[in-house]
């Protein structure tokens, strides 16, 4: 359908760069969560930082183009980078409205499929863009 995709929008304080320009922020009548209507894709993304005890959302918004993974109905994150020892960035892409609001599941840290602790290391801001 020709309707544009609408995603949850969030950027954690301290994250460098912004994906706000990839869409139009909507007035939803509530402060959170914010919604963004995508300009260049029909695809939402989410990035979570998984540590030993919890998962914390880093960014949510629109992708700049449609690519593999965008056909997914749900957010199924996969590991992408290590911003610091003991933490892993997981990202998802999905193609339904607000599909990036939450993830279906995250594998526990250190489980098969998670990069080893000697995987790529980066400064926190840089690792977000590596994950994207």
């Amino acid at each position: 359908p020709p309707n544009r995709r609408t995603c949850v929008f969030f950027e954690a304080p301290g994250v460098r760069g912004s994906t706000k320009t990839l869409g139009e922020l909507l007035d939803t009548g509530t402060e959170l969560p914010r919604a963004i209507r995508c300009l260049y894709s029909r695809c939402c993304f989410g990035i979570w930082n998984l540590t030993q005890d919890r998962a914390q959302v880093e960014m949510q918004g629109c992708r700049d183009s449609d690519e593999p993974g965008c056909e997914s109905l749900h957010c199924d994150p996969s590991p992408r980078a290590h911003p610091s020892p003991g933490s892993t960035l997981f990202t998802c892409s999905c193609g339904t409205d607000f599909c990036n609001a939450n993830y279906s599941h995250l594998p526990p840290p250190g489980s098969p499929g998670t990069p080893g602790s000697q995987g790529p290391q980066a400064a926190p801001g840089e690792s977000i863009w590596m994950a994207l």
């Epitope: 020709p2 309707n3 544009r4 609408t6 320009t21 139009e24 909507l26 007035d27 939803t28 009548g29 919604a35 209507r37 300009l39 260049y40 894709s41 700049d64 183009s65």
Partner: antibody
Framework: QVQLQESGPGLVKPSETLSLTCTVS?????????WNWIRQFPGKGLEWMGY???????SYNPSLKSRITISRDTSKNQFSLKLSSVTAADTAVYYC??????????WGQGTLVTVSS | DIQMTQSPSSLSASVGDRVTITCRAS??????????MHWYQQKPGKAPKLLIY???NLESGVPSRFSGSGSGTDFTLTISSLQPEDFATYYC?????????FGGGTKVEIK
Amino acid sequence: QVQLQESGPGLVKPSETLSLTCTVSGYSITSDFAWNWIRQFPGKGLEWMGYISFSGSTSYNPSLKSRITISRDTSKNQFSLKLSSVTAADTAVYYCAGSRYSWFAYWGQGTLVTVSS
Amino acid sequence: DIQMTQSPSSLSASVGDRVTITCRASESVDTYGNSFMHWYQQKPGKAPKLLIYRASNLESGVPSRFSGSGSGTDFTLTISSLQPEDFATYYCQQSNEDPYTFGGGTKVEIK
């Protein structure tokens, strides 16, 4: 501020390809925005033709999809329109326009293209 | 495609008049309560100029006598007190669905 300027031939023969270029000044076409082509027919109706985004992705009006190509030359800060197999019905004023959102805040002055033998 | 119908197609008015132009979409142009309807002014030989975006937001530098309202399928552009420089053609545009589409225009002429 953002400024746009269309250039290209004002007369194209039927069945040939219409080619126009838009030169952008005051802003890098790779920084942000969608870079659009819009045309206005002699009867004054406006038609959005398509865009190329700052990242290089394109979106076209389905009514033109088989005939239209929008490309860019980042070194010259230009984007271009090619419309193939033109007929007299493609006679129009062609505008390039920049859009940060889904409305058009920045326009070129327009260039008249006549399709005639 | 969403069809945009403007009315009237032309009107005659005097300086100081209150002028109302309507635009009706063939289907809703709202997304989660946000209206993706925009208005432009065009003078002869010039490119269209953005006046109002997202139904009711005044573009920077546009005089406050211009206002927009509406939601769903029915929208209005109002000029509260027509000035000599306002004689022009006005267009609506929707961007709720691809492809973006424009209304046929309303020409405001001097009475």
